[in-house]
């Protein structure tokens, strides 16, 4: 599945893990029918995609959640693909907000974001949300990616 | 538009369709502004795209929506991105699902489900949802595709 | 970043820009952590992407709007992707129509559109939604791009 | 690797019923999705339908969606297809499999497989 020895695919899907911790950071794993092109892209402590050669990529997160209006915050539901590059203040790339639902005990809602973006070498991506307790960990439901133009 | 004889670009983009079939799997059709890049990718039965070379795919759905909370079951609309492979199980790639609006008659949503998996000669992808009455078929609302990577 | 000189890489991602034009067209600006290959594509006018060379592009656009049920008409918020071809009538590529929120003053929202068309030479892109005084311009929320295959 | 014993399989007359059980042993943790096959004489295997372990979301086969349902007892690890409303074309062998976790997208992992259950459907 190469393009030609100097030009390998790189491309990356990985699946939602619930996670105990406090970080507005989701948490990734390769699991499931996960996509791991090979180790030109790779999943840092299950928390942000990781690229070894400059270039564009198009990155894309999905974030399922299950929210109620009255047991959140007045705050929308924020989710933002975030990048980090060597010697570089983080950056938002995208976001997208949903307002909670009305729906009890909670209304589920699906957000998807994706854009064309060139990244450094060593530029790791990864994705925030307001809060990470009402994501949905269900098969197929959350997940992040990208692939190497 | 090859990249090459032995690398032909391949991609689809298809239509949705109205069906009177009780099924939850969409209709598709290859009418309107869709593509059809050459016989390496195939809409089968008008309801999967099935691909004839192995390799990395980005694909994706956008299914729009017109419910209403009271008039629908409780669980939410759910869109499914599915995967049949030869003597595979199927499996559910990526899922997206929001809760039906309070507007009347009906409110109007969107859903994107879109990433990058690894599809094997043969392979079909089709689409879920739990209430095809409930699809809008307007111009350009709800579609189905991918492209190789 | 070339595929070689024949075949160099196209793509482009263009941030949202606020404007008082009471067009329902969006206006988009070179700035943030915007892409522009090379003048294979181009922003015209603050408003269309256009493209040099024939070919099949994956387009997106992602539209974050704040709304309110009382505040709106009736019609849902509507985004549309829409092609201009040279001596081509206007058409629609993609829409996405989410339902107004109850929430107060209003609520968030996330569209995402994406899909793979053939462009010819000097074709443009654009994106029209219902009410652009609803669109929200924070950094990432709202932004527009393609990519050549 | 997982061993996988099928049971439940018989003569049944059309628009009967019957229960398939598959109980699994040995590497249980490893598993992703179980699930069944069914081969007809002179027929390729076929997908009939699936579950996977990490939320129990199921996917069946157009020809048995409404007919049959698969679940599955995490405490005696082991899948079940309830079959009803059967007809002559259900006549098979019926095979379960299971597939290792993390398998991934880029990998056609062998999946395990039990020796299969014979259903007969007739008058």
């Known amino acids: 599945m190469q393009k030609g020895d100097q030009n390998p695919q790189i491309a990356a899907h990985v699946i939602s893990e619930a996670s105990s911790k406090t970080t507005s950071v989701l948490q990734w794993a390769e699991k499931g029918y996960y996509t791991m092109s090979n180790n030109l892209v790779t999943l840092e402590n299950g928390k942000q995609l990781t690229v070894k050669r400059q270039g564009l990529y198009y990155i894309y997160a999905q974030v399922t959640f299950c929210s109620n209006r009255e047991a959140s915050s007045q705050a929308p539901f924020i989710a933002s693909l975030c990048l980090k590059s060597p010697g570089r203040f983080e950056r938002i790339l995208l976001r997208a907000a949903n307002t909670h639902s009305s729906a009890k005990p909670c209304g589920q809602q699906s957000i998807h974001l994706g854009g064309v973006f060139e990244l450094q070498p060593g530029a790791s991506v990864f994705v925030n949300v307001t809060d990470p307790s009402q994501v949905s960990h269900g098969t197929g439901f959350t997940s992040f990616g990208l692939l190497k133009l | 538009m090859q990249k090459g004889d032995q690398n032909p670009q391949i991609a689809a983009h298809v239509i949705s369709e109205a069906s009177s079939k009780t099924t939850s799997v969409l209709q598709w059709a290859e009418k309107g502004y869709y593509t059809m890049s050459n016989n390496l990718v195939t809409l089968e039965n008008g309801k999967q795209l099935t691909v004839k070379r192995q390799g990395l795919y980005y694909i994706y759905a956008q299914v729009t929506f017109c419910s209403n909370r009271e008039a629908s079951s409780q669980a939410p609309f759910i869109a499914s991105l599915c995967l049949k492979s030869p003597g595979r199980f199927e499996r559910i790639l990526l899922r997206a699902a929001n809760t039906h609006s309070s507007a009347k008659p009906c409110g109007q949503q969107s859903i994107h489900l879109g990433g990058v998996f690894e599809l094997q000669p043969g392979a079909s992808v089709f689409v879920n949802v739990t209430d095809p009455s409930q699809v809008s078929h307007g111009t350009g609302f709800t579609s189905f595709g991918l492209l190789k990577l | 970043m070339q595929k070689g000189d024949q075949n160099p890489q196209i793509a482009a991602h263009v941030i949202s820009e606020a404007s008082s034009k009471t067009t329902s067209v969006l206006q988009w600006a070179e700035k943030g952590y915007y892409t522009m290959s090379n003048n294979l594509v181009t922003l015209e006018n603050g408003k269309q992407l256009t493209v040099k060379r024939q070919g099949l592009y994956y387009i997106y656009a992602q539209v974050t709007f704040c709304s309110n049920r009382e505040a709106s008409s009736q019609a849902p918020f509507i985004a549309s992707l829409c092609l201009k071809s040279p001596g081509r009538f206007e058409r629609i590529l993609l829409r996405a129509a989410n339902t107004h929120s109850s929430a107060k003053p209003c609520g968030q929202q996330s569209i995402h559109l994406g899909g793979v068309f053939e462009l010819q030479p000097g074709a443009s892109v654009f994106v029209n939604v219902t009410d652009p005084s609803q669109v929200s311009h924070g950094t990432g929320f709202t932004s527009f791009g393609l990519l050549k295959l | 690797e997982v061993q996988l014993v099928e049971s439940g399989g018989g003569l049944v007359q059309p628009g009967g019923s019957l229960r398939l059980s598959c109980a699994a042993s040995?590497?249980?943790?490893?598993?992703?999705?179980m699930g069944w096959f069914r081969q007809a004489p002179g027929k390729e295997r076929e997908f009939v339908a699936v579950?996977?372990?990490?939320?129990?979301?199921?996917l069946y086969a157009d020809s048995v969606k409404g007919r049959f349902t698969i679940s599955a007892d995490n405490s005696k690890n082991t899948a079940y297809l309830q079959m009803n409303s059967l007809k002559p074309e259900d006549t098979a062998v019926y095979y379960c499999?299971?597939?290792?976790?993390?398998?991934?997208?880029?990998?056609?992992?062998?999946?395990?497989w039990g020796q299969g259950t014979l259903v007969t459907v007739s008058s």
């Open positions: 040995g590497n249980i943790f490893r598993i992703n999705a």
């Open positions: 579950i996977y372990s990490s939320d129990g979301s199921t």
């Open positions: 499999a299971a597939e290792p976790y993390g398998s991934g997208s880029s990998l056609i992992s062998e999946y395990d």
